[in-house]
Structure formats: structure tokens, C-alpha cells
Interface confidence: low
Amino acid sequence: TIDTKRNISAEEGGSVILQCHFSSDTAEVTQVDWKQQDQLLAIYSVDLGWHVASVFSDRVVPGPSLGLTFQSLTMNDTGEYFCTYHTYPGGIYKGRIFLKVQESSDDRNGLAQFQTAPLG
């Protein structure tokens, strides 16, 4: 079975961990696919390790475990995320997470944030 938090929220500009937990007494995980709606985010395979889709490579970090850390979130990242566990034997198990990206608390308070970069 797949156990996951069905609904999670995070702040714009922040990061979030997408995590599915697979439990079985007999099946071995051979591959995990992560998708944002229908778009591939990342794939983990037992022998070949992680592959992150190039379009997300600057914002998606593999882990912890078989999950993903999604960084620099934007409002457009709000939506459904799916983990697909390929197991042997036992077939395919899927989990769903709904991520809601909210405005940062400072923005909601009407405060503008400025950051100056040092010259040189």
C-alpha cells in the first residue's frame, strides 16, 4: 500500500518535501516515478539511481528517501502530484498529493521584501 499526506501546503518561494511511503512484506521497489499532473518530474530506479527531468533540474532535488524536495515554489506549482511505485512482484502502486502553494506570510501582511546584493 501507499501512504501519503493527501493535501499539503507551502509558501511561495519556499520548498516542500513530496513523500510517498510504500509498505509491503513481500514486494521490492524497483522504480519510482514522480509526476506533476501528466508531466514527468523525476524517476528513481534501483540500479540506475535518480533522473530528474531537465525542465525541473534546477528546482527538484531527489530525496529524502524516495521522495522529492521541490524548491523555489511558485503559485503555478499548485496542483496534483503523483508517485508511482513499480514493485516486483506485485505490480504498480500509485499515490496522490495535492500541493497548495500560498503567498508568503510577509506578502499577505502587505510587506514588500527587498534584498540588496553586494557589489563587486
Epitope: T30, L40, D47, L48, H51, H86, Y88, G91, I92
Partner: antibody, heavy 116, light 110 residues
Framework: QVQLQESGPGLVKPSETLSLTCTVS????????MSWIRQPPGKGLEWIGI?????NTYYANWAKGRVTISKSSNQVSLKLSSVTAADTAVYYC????????????WGQGTLVTVSS | DIQMTQSPSSLSASVGDRVTITCQAS??????LAWYQQKPGKAPKLLIY???TLASGVPSRFSGSGSGTDFTLTISSLQPEDFATYYC????????????FGQGTKVEIK
């Protein structure tokens, strides 16, 4: 250069175990996937199974319980038990087969006939 | 299980013809697809991997396209040495699979 060579008996009796060896040169099995494929006379390619770089094995549904793939330093072995005439085929080994760059190269193949 | 379905199973064509072979996967395999050519009595030869990348030494008249579930092998101008059987192969998943290959397409002389 990369080379693969299958070897083993060309004739196996029904109910016995088919044993083949694929000897490789020009690359390391410790960082490669190796696949076994067979082709019955006049028919298409049938995948048998694969062994990963770390020794993990995955077998075709039809072969589970009958097939064992293993490897040593420069050889990959295939054992198929309880053979019948339907297992008569040309057997190939090939490098790759899972999230790689295709199966390449292939051995030349060896014909195994199951008959009493 | 992922099933690979090739079409047509055979075709007749003339030298110089443009030939197209299709391969359909029963589920999304992204770009994890390879194409092979096999001539009678010989081992298969890799033509294309990752759906569209030409293998080393393969003539540029061969090309591959597609992703997800639908893939195509195209021979832009058929040559005498291209009469053979062609197979697609999914590389996406090896657990819980019956066969990674399509059933083959035989290209014959018209």
C-alpha cells in the same frame, strides 16, 4: 573491442535444464546490464530476463520459476529448467536493456534444440 | 505489464520508398524505446535508442520519433540492404513484464 559469445549444449532433453554461458570482453559486467533474449524458429524476439550491475535480476512473467540468471567476473549464465519443445530457439545475450542506450552489442546467438 | 504493439506486421516496398513503422506502448514509457533491425540468420542490430537517437554507424536515412505511448521508425529512402525485420523494445520497466519487444515488422521487396 566489446564482444559477447554464447556457448552451451545445442541439444537438451525434455524436462532437463538448459544451461548457457555468455562470455564478455571489452567491458566490465560490474557496471553493465545484461539481457537474455530468445527467438523460436520463424518467430519474433522473446525477452527472458535481465541482470543488473548490482546483481538484481528481473525475469519475464512466462519464465518466472523456471529461469535463473547469474554472473561472475566476465560471464553471464542462463539456466532454464523443465524445458519442453517450445523452448527450442536461438538464445542471445546482449548488453543493456533497461534505461540504457538499447541492447548493444548482441552475441551471435546459439541454437538450442529440445528433443529426446 | 507493458505491451508493445507494432504495425504493420509486414509490408512490401520498393527501393527508394519512404517506409514508416509504428510501435505503441500500452502505457507511458516516456522516451525509453529502442529499434532493431534483424536479417535472416543474424543477431538483431541496434538502430535507434531513446526513441530518436541514432546508434553509432547507422545510416542517417533511419530516424525515430515519438514519446509516451506512440513511436515511429522511418526509413526515408529504402535501400536494398534495408529489407529485414524490425523490432521495437521498451526499456522503461523490467519488473512484471511478459515481453519487452514488439512482435516485429517484416519489410519485403515489392
Amino acid at each position: 573491442q566489446v564482444q559477447l559469445q554464447e556457448s552451451g549444449p545445442g541439444l537438451v532433453k525434455p524436462s532437463e535444464t538448459l544451461s548457457l554461458t555468455c562470455t564478455v570482453s571489452g567491458f566490465s559486467l560490474s557496471s553493465s546490464y545484461m539481457s537474455w533474449i530468445r527467438q523460436p524458429p520463424g518467430k519474433g524476439l522473446e525477452w527472458i530476463g535481465i541482470i543488473g550491475s548490482n546483481g538484481n535480476t528481473y525475469y519475464a512473467n512466462w519464465a518466472k520459476g523456471r529461469v535463473t540468471i547469474s554472473k561472475s567476473s566476465n560471464q553471464v549464465s542462463l539456466k532454464l529448467s523443465s524445458v519442453t519443445a517450445a523452448d527450442t530457439a536461438v538464445y542471445y545475450c546482449a548488453r543493456g536493456g533497461y534505461r540504457t542506450s538499447g541492447m548493444d552489442p548482441w552475441g551471435q546467438g546459439t541454437l538450442v534444440t529440445v528433443s529426446s | 505489464d507493458i505491451q508493445m504493439t507494432q504495425s504493420p506486421s509486414s509490408l512490401s516496398a520498393s527501393v527508394g520508398d519512404r517506409v514508416t513503422i509504428t510501435c505503441q506502448a500500452s502505457q507511458n514509457i516516456y522516451s525509453d524505446l529502442a529499434w532493431y533491425q534483424q536479417k535472416p540468420g543474424k543477431a538483431p542490430k541496434l538502430l535507434i535508442y531513446r526513441a530518436s537517437t541514432l546508434a553509432s554507424g547507422v545510416p542517417s536515412r533511419f530516424s525515430g520519433s515519438g514519446s509516451g505511448t506512440d513511436f515511429t521508425l522511418t526509413i526515408s529512402s529504402l535501400q536494398p540492404e534495408d529489407f529485414a525485420t524490425y523490432y521495437c523494445q521498451q526499456e522503461h520497466l523490467v519488473a512484471w513484464i511478459y515481453n519487452v519487444f514488439g512482435q516485429g515488422t517484416k519489410v519485403e521487396i515489392k
